[in-house]
Interface confidence: medium
């Protein structure tokens, strides 16, 4: 057959798998006269041979790791041994098989990491090599953490980049590592070839000792800085320090202020760069950041708090250029005229903003000076000497000095003398009848207009009308707004109406003046009006506070543990009864009054997590309307499943008699969760009596090899007990049995005489 395995002499390339015993020729070169024989030179390594007739072959298995390419030359010779053709290059490419295990460069690594280091930032690399071809899975390495010691509450503090071997902290490690509690950790790291994806991969392990060092990258105590400082700026106020020299510090203003008065130097010292003004901003919160030379953050930012301390740098201010009060002609001595409320921008409730009031001038001084007095601290003006007469002096002007401990301000008050309030407001009708509203009427709706009139001096406190609801609305669901020009009252809904608590409300209004009535005049029935508010029911279902309630517990919580709770409210205010729907596993009960959910049976993550049930909230009484929400219970794994065999191993056999010790491979598994790594089982023989005949050796975390120790076995079935421990917390052990039959074989299968065919083993070793 010309072409594939034979042909003329020309440059050629062949690919051959390493490790394979020769099974066929490589090529048959055909000679063209005068050539009669062939000669092979180059990197033959005494493996490649060419027969005189041109048959190129190899005589033993190749090893890619010794030589990955053999560069050969083939020449054609004539009868006298003279080269008449060639030599031509023949290239043998050796294809890789997985015949080398990965090995770590060190059997032990040591490293250190600071507490609170950034998750995912490598602090140590482990490195393994594999002589196989890295361009194929045979040389592609996969790193894994096998175990972390101590392992606190099943939480992994460390993680490894499967491809690079970079070890870093997990989020939990960053938060929880504390040298005061645990100054050192040990990791066992495995490396597998085949990218970790094959059960035939080779592996190696190494040990990593990690020291946890203290983190001095901590937020400083809050700083107090006096405002308007006259000291030379910048002023150092606090400091931060990265754990190692060479960090680049910066400040981040999260509030994006137009003026950010802080800076940091490359020692980590923080300065205020200009005087602060408490009245502009009384506190600052910003962040200090440490970065490496490439500008990458070394850790999380630190929060810096600066409180600005008040000094008395603000004078009192008047509420308005002129404050206007009214006083009736006949008012008695001591009556309150009104209160002047000045302001001070300095810090509240301190001496810097504590104000004193004093009248410094009254004009006109008719009929005398000192007609008014002001309460020193409260600012309340009172009539001091006698009643006033509008026809003599209709208006007084007061100049009032308002002072804090350092500053004085003058405020101006105008006091208008008005007619006596001897007329009461009179409602246009005493009964506004019935009004029927649904309980879901919008807040802010105007539901009624009321009107009263007052014959006193217009646009004074004697004729102004204020409407109050004095009866029938203890919940404050209604309010009345007054139009100051017309004295019309608009009754509005301030809070939701509620059929359940107030189906009928008998409302009574009172119309009053802000000014007191003269002595002897009293409000009478004319100043009162009533109306009846009838609220109709709008029944609504209870409302859950969430669409989905979620809780997380370990699968082994004690029965009776509160695992969560739900809340719903009924718009009508009816009581609610809670129940569960869809609790198919009978794991939960709900307190029908409080909504608390308890476990009533053992939980099992392996049966399915999260466990989803529906919670129902039903009105008690009424129309029994109900609403449904979801409750999801996430079950955290505990090590509660012992290891077992991964498949059925009946039918294992060895041909009897054994010519040499034999072995078989088996796989274990368990049903628990293995988040950070695969299982890490250890294997041993189930009883001491088996040790003379058998031995178990671990291949990796899930596979082991059972080997015979000798060849002297009887022709029968042996049941080999294997103890498999999962090394979990708590550790669980399973004892499994591997039935192995030693039998006479015919063509590699167990032979049984007729009548003895039951249970023939099918797997030969």
């Amino acid at each position: 057959q010309e072409g594939k395995f034979s042909g003329p002499l020309k440059p050629m390339t062949f690919s051959i798998y390493e490790g394979q015993e020769p099974s066929q020729i490589i090529f048959q070169f055909k000679a063209n006269p005068p050539a009669v024989t062939f000669e092979l030179t180059g990197e033959t390594d005494n493996i490649f041979v060419i027969e005189r007739e041109g048959l190129l072959y190899y005589n033993r298995a190749l090893d890619r790791e010794t030589r990955s390419t053999h560069n050969l030359q083939v020449a054609a010779l004539d009868a006298n041994g003279i080269i008449v053709e060639g030599p031509v290059p023949i290239t043998i490419k050796v294809k890789d098989i997985n015949d080398n295990r990965p090995t770590f460069l060190q059997s032990k690594y040591e490293g250190s990491v600071r507490q609170n280091s950034r998750p995912g930032k490598p602090f140590l690399y482990v490195n393994a090599t594999d002589l196989d071809d890295p361009a194929t899975p045979n040389g592609q390495l996969y790193y894994q953490i096998v175990i972390q010691l101590p392992m606190i509450n099943n939480v992994m503090y460390f993680q490894i980049n499967n491809k690079t071997g970079a070890i870093s902290l997990t989020r939990e490690g960053s938060q929880e590592l504390n040298p005061a509690k645990n100054p050192s950790y040990n990791l066992v790291i495995s490396v597998k070839d085949m990218g970790g994806q094959s059960e035939n991969s080779f592996s190696d392990t190494t040990s990593v000792d990690i020291i946890v060092t203290e983190n001095i990258w901590k937020a400083p105590k809050p700083v107090e800085m006096v405002e308007n400082s006259t000291d030379p700026h910048p002023i150092k106020i606090t400091q931060v320090r990265w754990n190692d020299p060479g960090a680049q510090y910066s400040l981040v203003d999260k509030e994006k202020l137009p003026r950010f008065p802080f800076s940091i130097d490359q020692e980590g010292d923080i300065y205020v760069t200009q005087p602060l003004d408490r009245e502009e901003k009384d506190a600052y919160v910003f962040y200090a950041v440490a970065k490496d030379e490439y500008g990458k953050p070394l850790s999380y930012p630190l929060e810096i708090h600066v409180k600005v301390k008040d000094i008395n740098d603000n004078p009192p201010t008047c509420p308005s250029p002129v404050t206007v009060f009214e006083v009736q002609e006949n008012e008695r001595l001591g009556n309150s005229i009104g209160t002047l409320t000045a302001h001070d921008r300095d810090e509240e409730n301190t001496a810097n903003s504590f104000l004193n009031y004093r009248i410094v001038e009254q004009t006109p001084k008719l009929p005398m000076d000192g007609l008014f007095l002001i309460q020193t601290y409260a600012g309340m003006l009172q009539l001091a000497k006698q009643s006033l007469k509008k026809q003599d002096t209709p208006q007084y002007n007061l100049t009032i000095e308002v002072s804090d401990k350092d500053f004085k301000t003058l405020c101006f008050v105008q006091i208008n003398v008005i007619d006596i309030n001897d007329q009461i407001p009179i409602f246009e009708k005493s009964d506004y009848g019935n009004l029927t509203l649904a309980e879901d009427t919008n807040i802010g709706s105007t539901i009624l207009t009321i009107q009263a009139t007052d014959a006193d001096e217009p646009f004074t406190g004697s004729s102004k009308i204020l409407y109050h609801i004095i009866k029938g609305d203890s919940e404050g669901r209604l309010g009345v707004d007054t139009d100051p020009h017309t004295n019309t009252g608009y009754v509005i809904i301030k809070k939701p109406l509620d059929f359940e608590t107030a189906a009928v409300s008998n409302i009574v209004f009172k119309a009053e003046n802000p000014e007191p009535l003269v002595f002897g005049v009293k409000y009478n029935a004319s100043s009162f009006a009533k109306f009846t508010l009838i609220v109709t029911d709008v029944n609504e279902a209870p409302q859950f506070s969430q669409h989905v309630f979620q809780a997380k517990v370990s699968e082994d919580v004690a029965i009776g543990t509160k695992v969560g709770n739900v809340t719903a409210k009924d718009p009508e205010g009816l009581d609610i009864s809670y129940s569960l729907r869809g609790d198919t596993r009978g794991w939960l009960k709900i307190d029908h009054v409080t909504g608390e959910i308890f476990s009533v049976a053992p939980l099992d993550r392996e049966a399915g997590s999260p466990y989803r049930v529906q919670v129902v909230a039903t009105e008690v009484g009424g129309s029994s309307l109900s609403s449904v929400s979801e409750f999801h219970l996430i079950l955290m794994d505990v090590n509660d499943n012992p290891p077992r065999l991964a498949k059925d191993y009946t039918g294992l056999f060895f041909c009897h008699p054994l010519s040499a010790p034999g072995s078989l491979i088996f796989e274990a598994t368990d049903d628990d969760q293995h988040l950070f790594r695969g299982p890490h089982f250890t294997f041993s023989l189930g009883s001491g009596s088996l040790q003379n005949d058998w031995e178990v050796s671990k291949i990796n975390g899930t596979h082991a090899r059972l080997s015979t120790r000798h060849t002297e076995f009887e022709e029968r079935e042996y049941v080999v007990l294997i103890r498999i421990n999962d090394g979990g917390r708590p550790p669980l052990e399973g004892i499994v049995s591997l039935p192995v039959t030693f039998c006479s074989c015919v063509e590699g299968s167990c032979f049984r005489p007729a009548g003895h065919q039951t249970g023939i083993p099918t797997v030969g070793m």
Partner: antibody, heavy 122, light 107 residues
Framework: EVQLVESGGGVVRPGGSLRLSCAAS????????MSWVRQAPGKGLEWVSG????????YYADSVRGRFTISRDNAKNSLYLQMNSLRAEDTALYYC???????????????WGQGTLVTVSS | DIQMTQSPSSLSASVGDRVTITCRAS??????LGWYQQKPGKAPKRLIY???SLQSGVPSRFSGSGSGTEFTLTISSLQPEDFATYYC?????????FGPGTKVEIK
């Protein structure tokens, strides 16, 4: 060092009240449930009350339900037992014991205090 | 409530003896069971958790086994410091309950 120290025991008349405290140190207190266990003189151990890590769930033995209240202050790393309407049969050494982390119950009751003595006598 | 019983209530043994204490629960408690040792005037000390796991720092002569309703604590070779009272505790179901105790005395 992980440590629990009880205090607040003493002599009290029947019907009286007492408040026990337990100060925790050396571990992250707010990660763990806690319990009170008592032991009457010459008798065995009796679980009295338990509380989950954040104080949201409390549990009591029937013998004390309605009279005793368990609480905790995570900011102060402290556990408390308010005992009202005390009876002679409440006389015991009261131990504070660390429960399990969050709700991981297999690992409960690994750390115990030395106990504080409560004597109810007229 | 789950009742816990222990047997024997007391036993006398010599140094080097193998000692077994049994604890029974009135209903299944999975493996939520611990064994505690208490010496006079001292607080209880946990020996075994999760029915069969040895507390770190506890000598390996102590072992636990069982699941469900029947559990045993075994001391493979009694030492002088092991003379004490031993309690089992179930924390499978509220209220948690202790066994009445087994006193191990010197013969």
């Amino acid at each position: 060092e992980v440590q629990l120290v009880e205090s607040g025991g003493g002599v009290v008349r029947p019907g009286g009240s007492l408040r026990l405290s337990c100060a925790a140190s050396g571990f992250t207190f707010d990660n763990y449930g806690m319990s009170w266990v008592r032991q009457a003189p010459g008798k065995g151990l009796e679980w009295v009350s338990g509380i989950n890590w954040n104080g949201g769930s409390t549990y009591y033995a029937d013998s004390v339900r309605g009279r005793f209240t368990i609480s905790r202050d995570n900011a102060k790393n402290s556990l408390y037992l308010q005992m009202n309407s005390l009876r002679a049969e409440d006389t015991a050494l009261y131990y504070c014991a660390r429960g399990s982390r969050y709700n991981w119950s297999y690992d409960a009751f690994d750390i115990w205090g030395q106990g504080t003595l409560v004597t109810v006598s007229s | 409530d789950i009742q816990m019983t222990q047997s024997p209530s007391s036993l006398s043994a010599s140094v080097g003896d193998r000692v077994t204490i049994t604890c029974r629960a009135s209903q299944g408690v999975r493996n939520a069971l611990g064994w505690y040792q208490q010496k006079p005037g001292k607080a209880p000390k946990r020996l075994i958790y999760a029915a069969s796991s040895l507390q770190s720092g506890v000598p390996s002569r102590f072992s636990g086994s069982g699941s469900g309703t029947e559990f045993t604590l075994t001391i493979s070779s009694l030492q002088p410091e092991d003379f004490a009272t031993y309690y089992c505790l179930q924390h499978n179901s509220y209220p948690f309950t202790f066994g009445p105790g087994t006193k191990v005395e010197i013969k």
